[in-house]
Interface confidence: low
């Protein structure tokens, strides 16, 4: 008769580091002591006729245990295979590129340390929750890769790595481990340089707008812009509208920047840079300044009029040009009554890179002269009818402007000047029309001949 040695449990599965209670039993009536052969740490817990119970502790790896007993001088054996399962100790997705150009491939790499049994361990690479790759874990550590074509939609997307230990056939379920996610940043930077709109000329101490625009940029909000006039960085206001980035700044030229300069616009995204440069000439244009040696001159005095401007500026005073750019234009005159109120015009021209810039200035001369009455506007003999309305059309001139009064000789009777009045016979007579100012008096005699009103 053939006797058996049973080992229970048969082919157990347990988690790494766990303990196992093993029972060996036989139906042989004359069996000796049952022995357990294993490399694992074991302890005999109990035994009796035809059986023995052992405790196996700290089971870390797959193992085969063997029970043996002598029955009637012959050895009989029984065995059981222990399968140990363990979750991975480390699941890590390798760092992604800091910026990934859209339309180019990049590689996802996942490393898995530990985890058993390897035959039941699968590594999955994910974008959001979408599976990009599913591969078995082979070596230790297992390294799984996938090549992905970067798209705009990938910007900001989380990528992760997941391990699946499938112990469902053993009735233990599916054990999942996931790495920390890594976020991808994708970008598009066109090969074309930015469009830079800047003035060709900029006057010292003046401000002008500078606009720098780049289309087809993604994500525009992440781009860095550097705008500068020479080595002077400009404070730019950056705006994004869709895939267009616009930087606007105010360029103000300093005196020490005079001459040929460059306006530079750099747009940096994803570690790449696009640059535009425009030439600009910073110029200073002082004047023109028109001066009178005497703003208020006396009749007959000599007045000098001069016009000056900055270096390289050609001035022309009342049509007379200065000898050379940067020099003063001058003219002299003997002040006469006709020069009172005269304006002297000075135009200044500066050539900047082949373009001519023009500015004008003027000054007005005042000439002080004594009072005069214009005989042409003041008839010396007037024949008027009684009881009619007339105007004494006399005008005085002078600087300061004189007061004009017409008084009847031998009386203090005054007739209005320049405004209508009713004439009667009492107005008959000779009048002293006197223009007076702080610069003297001028008298003109006017005779009024009033013809009496006839009732016929």
């Amino acid at each position: 008769q053939e006797f058996l040695l049973r080992v229970e449990p048969q082919n157990p599965v347990l988690s790494a580091g766990g303990s196992l209670f093993v029972n060996c039993s036989t139906d042989c009536p004359s069996s000796e002591k049952i022995a357990l052969e294993t490399s694992l740490s074991k302890e005999l817990v109990a035994s009796g006729m035809g059986w023995a119970a052992f405790n196996l502790s700290n089971v870390t790896g797959n193992s085969r245990i063997l029970c043996s007993v002598y029955c009637n001088g012959s050895q009989i054996t029984g065995s059981s295979n222990i399968t140990v399962y363990g979750l991975p100790e480390r699941v890590e997705l390798a760092p992604l590129p800091p910026w990934q150009p859209v339309g180019q491939n990049f590689t996802l790499r996942c490393q898995v340390e530990g985890g058993s049994p390897r035959t039941s361990l699968t590594v999955v690479l994910l974008r959001w929750e979408e599976e990009l790759s599913r591969q078995p874990a082979v070596e230790e550590p297992a390294e799984v890769t996938a090549t992905v074509l970067a798209s705009r939609d990938d910007h900001g997307a989380p990528f992760s790595c997941r391990t699946e230990l499938d112990m469902q056939p053993q009735g233990l379920g599916l054990f999942v481990n996931t790495s920390a996610p890594r976020q991808l940043r994708t970008f598009v930077l066109p090969v074309t340089p930015p469009r830079l709109v800047a003035p060709r000329f900029l006057e010292v101490e003046t401000s002008w707008p500078v606009d720098c625009t780049l289309d087809g940029l993604f994500p525009a909000s992440e781009a860095q812009v550097y705008l500068a006039l020479g080595d002077q960085m400009l404070n730019a206001t950056v705006m994004n509208h869709g895939d267009t980035l616009t930087a606007t700044a105010t360029a103000t030229a300093r005196a020490d920047q005079e001459g040929a300069r460059e306006i530079v616009c750099n747009v940096t995204l994803g570690g790449e840079r696009r640059e535009a440069r425009e030439n600009l000439t910073v110029f200073s244009f002082l004047g023109p300044i028109v001066n009178l040696s005497e703003p208020t001159a006396h009749e007959g005095s000599t007045v000098t009029v001069s016009c000056m401007a900055g270096a390289r500026v050609q001035v022309t005073l009342d049509g007379v040009p200065a000898a050379a750019p940067g020099q003063t234009a001058q003219l002299q005159l003997n002040a006469t009554e006709s020069d009172d109120g005269r304006s002297f015009f000075c135009s200044a021209t500066l050539e900047v890179d082949g373009e001519f810039l023009h500015r004008n200035s003027s000054v007005q001369l005042r000439v002080l002269y004594g009072p005069k009455i214009d005989r042409a506007t003041c008839p010396q003999h007037l024949k008027w009818k009684d009881k009619t309305r007339h105007v004494l059309q006399c005008q005085a001139r002078g600087n300061p402007y004189p007061e004009l009064r017409c008084l009847k000789e031998g009386s203090s009777r005054e007739v209005p000047v320049g405004i209508p009045f009713f004439v009667n016979v009492t107005h008959n007579g000779t009048y002293q029309c006197q223009a007076s100012s702080s610069r003297g008096k001028y008298t003109l005699v006017v005779v009024m001949d009033i013809e009496a009103f006839s009732s016929h």
Epitope: V197, A198, T237, T250
Partner: antibody
Framework: EVQLQQSGPELVKPGASVKISCKAS????????ILWVKQSHGKGLEWIGK????????TYNLKFKGKATLTVDKSSSTAHMQLNSLTSEDSAVYYC????????????WGQGTSVTVSS | DAVMTQTPLSLPVSLGDQASISCRSS???????????LHWYLQKPGQSPQLLIY???NRFSGVPDRFSGSGSGTDFTLKLSRVEAEDLGVYFC?????????FGGGTKLEIK
Amino acid sequence: EVQLQQSGPELVKPGASVKISCKASGYSFTDCIILWVKQSHGKGLEWIGKINPYFGTTTYNLKFKGKATLTVDKSSSTAHMQLNSLTSEDSAVYYCARKEAYPDAMDYWGQGTSVTVSS
Amino acid sequence: DAVMTQTPLSLPVSLGDQASISCRSSQSLVHSNGDTYLHWYLQKPGQSPQLLIYKVSNRFSGVPDRFSGSGSGTDFTLKLSRVEAEDLGVYFCSQSTHVPYTFGGGTKLEIK
């Protein structure tokens, strides 16, 4: 006296283009910036863009880029705005205005040009 | 873009009353040069807008002293000390610190 005189009202068909003008007088045309503003019932006042007559440089509101093109004719002291591919959304009153310093207020405005887009 | 929000939408007043209009910006209007480019315009019925106040508080030439502007950063106010019939119309605030320049939706000043 500063004046900005705009061209008369326009009735245009969808898909067409229109060019409106703004003639400046009473000041040196190249000394000030010309700006354009749209006024429609639904959206109030909207800034379209600006042009520097001296240099001919332009700055657009990105919303109107491709829709509006700003130009100047220095010889006649006139600013122009061309509106392309017109739709009913472009029906509005368009104003030109000027400003002196950068960036400063629009101190004088044209009387406005009414553009009606209708088939 | 700098969004300009005006309140109230409509402001019914009696002639001689005081009136106040508020304008708030979604971002600071202080320019890099230190100036604040916030302006007020009035559009009378059937007319173009006209400038009243520039750079927060400066009255444009010919604007009566009953108009005054104040504020800083993002909050601004236009005040009329005594409303007259010629003041009726729609008031707009506007900024030219940031491109694109933007306008408030307008406040209609009307007789009660």
